[in-house]
C-alpha cells in the first residue's frame, strides 16, 4: 500500500475548479524532493502535467498550480476551467521519476447537468443574494405567483403572492414585480446558505394553464486562497465583500473546528494573542479593508475568514472570504528579540532586520497603538523627521550591507512601554514587532554626564564628560550630536583607555567631548554612548544650552531640558501626545498596511529630507582635546 494519500475520486462539472491535496510521510527527503501530478495513459506511461520543479504542460498552461507545504507534509494541485477532456486517471506522487511513491486519483468531469427545459442555472457564493426570474403569460397576470423548492418528488412552497413565506426563508425571501412588467415576476433570496442549493420551480396560475419555470441554484463555499508565509514575516489579508455590506462592521476570524474566533473587528474587539502585531485598515467606501499581521508565529497557521455583520461577529448567511495560511519554519528572516527591557532614565538599542538585498530601502520605526483597529504612527525614519516628543532621544542608525538597522531610544519613561514595529518601504515580509517594557530604575544609570546643567558660552571652550563603568572598558565610546535626521558621531577623547584593563579604576573612566570655540549652532542634544562595531549599546543624553558671553540668562533652561531623563513630568508627556497628533501629516500610519501605499510614505518623507546621515561626523564643531 502506498504511503501517499489523497482523494481517490474527485468529481466536478465543466467550468469548475478542483483542489486536490496529497499527503506524504513527514521526512526530510520527502519534504524537499520533486512533487508531481501526471496523467495515466493506456500504455502504462504517466505523462507529467505539472511538477514542483516548475514544469507545466501545455494543456495546463494558465489554469493549474502545484504548491508544496512541507510543514504540513502535503502538496496541493489546483486545476481550473475543467472540461470533460480532463476526465481520467491521475497520480500525485513524489520522486525524480513518475515511478516513485504515488497515489491514484480518478477525476470525473461531467457536463453541466441536464435540467428540465427552461432551467436557468444560478451560481452564487454563500451570503450573497440571488434574484430568480419567473416568466408567465398574460392570462396568468392576476393569478397567484409562487416559488417552491423540489425535495424528491414534492415541491415545498418557499414564498407566494399571498404573503406566505416558509419559516426557513423568513426575512430572506421577497416576491416582487418590477415597474409595469406584466409577464415577469422575481424572487430575491438573500443571505444564502449551503442548504438553499437545489432545484426551484416558479409558477404563475393553477392547474394545466399554469406557467412554470425551473431554476437550479448552486451555493458555493468560498474556496480558500492559499497563503504561504515565512516564520516571523507578515501577511496581509485583502478583503473585498462587496458594496452591500459596506456599512456593516467588518471582522477577521480564525476557524477553530465549528466556530470562527474573531481576531479583530471594526467594533474594537481584538484577540490578545495578536496584541501589538495587527492592523485593520479600511481601503475605500465600498467595504474593502485589509488586515495586516506581523511577526508570524507557527501557531498562526490555519484557516482565516473575513466577513461583515452589524455585530462584528461571524453570522451564517453573510458574505465571507477565506484563506488558508501556512507558516514556513525555514524562514529567511532572522530571529530577533521580541521583548526588549529598559529602565526609566535609561536607553534601549533595538536591532531591526531588513532584507539585505534592499540596503537602499527607506527604514522606519513606528509605535503600534491599540485604539480600535490599531494604527502605527511613524516616529523616525531614514528620511523622515523625528516626531515631536521624541526630539533628542530617538535616532535611527542605518548600517548598509549588514541587513539590519538600529533604533536607539533614551531618556526612557514608563509611557514608552508598548509595541513598536520595524519596517521598510521594500520587502513587506520583513516587518518585525518588538515589545518594549520599561520598569522603574532601581540604581544609578551606567552612563553619567557632567556637568548636568550644561550651559556653554559662545567663543569659549566647553568640555563635557561622560563617566562609564569598567564593564564598558573594552567597548568603543562615542559622543554624537543629535539632529532630526540622526545622531552624528563627533571626535571625542577617552581618558580611561590609557589604563590597563586589569587595574580599571571605576571612578576615572571618562570619555569627554570639547566644543572649541563654542558656536550658536552647537546648542542642542548630545549623546554619550558605547558600541562594539555595529552593535550599539547604552546611551545617555544631555541638552547643551549656548548663551552669549554678555548675557546672563541662558537660551533654554538646561535643568528643564535634562530633567526629562529623570522624571518626565506628566504635563510634558501629555503635551507630546497632543503634538504628535497634530503632526500626522508627516507620515500617515495607515500607509503601512500595504505595499502599494508604503511607497507614498517614502515619497512624502522625501519632502522632509535633511542633509547628513546617521553616523557621519561632517559639519560638526566638536574637536579632540
Amino acid at each position: 500500500q502506498s504511503p501517499i494519500f489523497g482523494p481517490q475520486d474527485v468529481s466536478s462539472i465543466e467550468g469548475n475548479s478542483v483542489s486536490i491535496t496529497c499527503y506524504y510521510p513527514d521526512t526530510s527527503v520527502n519534504r524537499h524532493t520533486r512533487k508531481y501530478w501526471c496523467r495515466q495513459g493506456a500504455n502504462g506511461y504517466c505523462a507529467t502535467l505539472i511538477s514542483s520543479n516548475g514544469y507545466l504542460s501545455k494543456e495546463y498552461s494558465g489554469r493549474a498550480s502545484l504548491i508544496n507545504f512541507p510543514e504540513n507534509s502535503t502538496f496541493v494541485i489546483n486545476i481550473a476551467h475543467l472540461t470533460q477532456e480532463d476526465t481520467g486517471s491521475y497520480k500525485c506522487g513524489l520522486g525524480t521519476t513518475n515511478r516513485g511513491l504515488f497515489f491514484d486519483v480518478s477525476l470525473e468531469v461531467s457536463q453541466v447537468p441536464e435540467f428540465p427545459n427552461d432551467t436557468h442555472v444560478y451560481t452564487k457564493d454563500i451570503g450573497r443574494t440571488v434574484t430568480i426570474e419567473c416568466r408567465f403569460k398574460e392570462g396568468n397576470a392576476h393569478s397567484k405567483k409562487s416559488l417552491c423548492k423540489k425535495r424528491g418528488e414534492a415541491c415545498e412552497v418557499v414564498i407566494d403572492s399571498t404573503e406566505y413565506v416558509d419559516p426557513s426563508y423568513k426575512d430572506r425571501a421577497i416576491l416582487f414585480m418590477k415597474g409595469t412588467s406584466r409577464d415577469i415576476f422575481y424572487v430575491n433570496i438573500s443571505h444564502l446558505i449551503p442548504s438553499d442549493a437545489g432545484l426551484y420551480v416558479c409558477q404563475a396560475g393553477e392547474g394545466p394553464s399554469a406557467d412554470k419555470n425551473n431554476a437550479d441554484l448552486q451555493v458555493l463555499e468560498p474556496e480558500p486562497e492559499l497563503l504561504y508565509k515565512d516564520l516571523r514575516s507578515s501577511v496581509t489579508f485583502e478583503c473585498d465583500l462587496g458594496r452591500e455590506v459596506a456599512n456593516d462592521a467588518k471582522y477577521l476570524c480564525r476557524k477553530n473546528k465549528e466556530t470562527c474566533d474573531v481576531i479583530i473587528n471594526t467594533l474594537g474587539k481584538r484577540d490578545p494573542a495578536f496584541e501589538g502585531r495587527i492592523l485593520l485598515t479600511p481601503r475605500d467606501d465600498n467595504g474593502r479593508f485589509s488586515v495586516l499581521i506581523t511577526g508570524l508565529r507557527k501557531e498562526d497557521a490555519g484557516h482565516y475568514q473575513c466577513g461583515a455583520h452589524s455585530s462584528g461577529l461571524p453570522q451564517e448567511g453573510w458574505p465571507v472570504q477565506a484563506w488558508q495560511l501556512f507558516v514556513n519554519e525555514e524562514s529567511t528572516i532572522p530571529n530577533s528579540r521580541s521583548v526588549v527591557k529598559g529602565v526609566t532614565g535609561g536607553s534601549v538599542a533595538i536591532v531591526c532586520p531588513y532584507n539585505p538585498k534592499e540596503s537602499s530601502s527607506l527604514k522606519y520605526w513606528c509605535h503600534w497603538e491599540a485604539d480600535e483597529n490599531g494604527r502605527c504612527p511613524v516616529l523616525v525614519g531614514t528620511q523622515a523627521l523625528v516626531q515631536e516628543g521624541y526630539e533628542g532621544r530617538l535616532a535611527l542608525f542605518d548600517q548598509p550591507g549588514s541587513g539590519a538597522y538600529t533604533v536607539i531610544l533614551n531618556q526612557l519613561t514608563t509611557q514608552d512601554s508598548g509595541f513598536y514595529w520595524c519596517l521598510t518601504d521594500g520587502d513587506s515580509r520583513w516587518r518585525t514587532t518588538i515589545e518594549l517594557q520599561v520598569a522603574e530604575a532601581t540604581k544609578k544609570p551606567d552612563l553619567e554626564v557632567t556637568p548636568q546643567n550644561a550651559t556653554a558660552v559662545i567663543g569659549e571652550t566647553f568640555t563635557i564628560s561622560c563617566h562609564y563603568p569598567c564593564k564598558f572598558y573594552s567597548q568603543e565610546k562615542y559622543w554624537c550630536k543629535w539632529s532630526n535626521d540622526g545622531c552624528h558621531i563627533l571626535p571625542s577623547h577617552d581618558e580611561g583607555a590609557r589604563q590597563s584593563s586589569v587595574s580599571c579604576d571605576q571612578s576615572s573612566q571618562i570619555v569627554s567631548m570639547t566644543l572649541n570655540p563654542v558656536k550658536k549652532e552647537d546648542e542642542g542634544w548630545y549623546w554619550c554612548g558605547v558600541k562594539e562595531g555595529q552593535v550599539y549599546g547604552e546611551t545617555t543624553a544631555i541638552y547643551v544650552a549656548v548663551e552669549e558671553r554678555t548675557r546672563g540668562s541662558p537660551h533654554i533652561n538646561p535643568t528643564d531640558a535634562n530633567a526629562r531623563a529623570k522624571d518626565a513630568p506628566e504635563e510634558e508627556a501629555m503635551e507630546s501626545s497632543v503634538r504628535e497628533d497634530e503632526n500626522k501629516a508627516n507620515l500617515d500610519p495607515r500607509l503601512f498596511a500595504d505595499e502599494r501605499e508604503i511607497q507614498n510614505a517614502g515619497d512624502q518623507a522625501q519632502e522632509n529630507r535633511a542633509s547628513g546621515n546617521a553616523g557621519s561626523a561632517g559639519g560638526q564643531s566638536g574637536s579632540s582635546k
Partner: nanobody, 128 residues
C-alpha cells in the same frame, strides 16, 4: 454542532453487503466533510472513508483496506451520508461511527481529531 444518527448495521455473512446511513441535523450539512470510522473491540478507531463537497466538486477518500469494496456517498437534500459495503470480510466486524468536520475541512480527513461531531455508532458483524 450537527447531530448524527447512524443506522443500517447488523449481522451479515462474509461476502455479503450492507448499507449504512447517517442522518444529520442542521441547515449547513452540505458544507461539512463527512467521514466513517470504525472501531473493533480492543483496537484503535480507524478511518474508513470520507466525502467532502464544496458546492461544486465532490472529493471521496477511502482507506486502502476497503478500497474497491466500500463506497461513500451523500444526499444533501436528505442531509444523509451513506456507506455502501460490499464483499464484506470477518475483519470488517466493528462499531461504525459517522463523523462531521465543519468547513473548511481542517487537515487530514483520516485524523479523528479533525472531526467535532460524532454519532453513537452502529454495530456491523460479519460472520464467516
Amino acid at each position: 454542532q450537527v447531530q448524527l444518527v447512524e443506522s443500517g448495521g447488523g449481522l451479515v455473512q462474509a461476502g455479503g453487503s450492507l448499507r449504512l446511513s447517517c442522518a444529520a441535523s442542521g441547515r449547513t450539512f452540505s458544507s461539512y466533510a463527512m467521514g466513517w470510522f470504525r472501531q473493533a473491540p480492543g483496537k484503535e478507531r480507524e478511518f474508513v472513508a470520507a466525502i467532502h463537497w464544496n458546492g461544486a466538486s465532490t472529493y471521496r477518500y477511502s482507506a486502502d483496506s476497503v478500497k474497491g469494496r466500500f463506497t461513500i456517498s451523500r444526499d444533501n437534500a436528505k442531509n444523509t451520508v451513506y456507506l455502501q459495503m460490499n464483499s464484506l470480510k470477518p475483519e470488517d466486524t466493528a462499531a461504525y461511527y459517522c463523523a462531521a468536520s465543519p468547513p473548511p475541512t481542517v487537515g487530514d480527513v483520516r485524523d479523528p481529531a479533525n472531526y467535532d461531531s460524532w454519532g453513537q455508532g452502529t454495530l456491523v458483524t460479519v460472520s464467516s
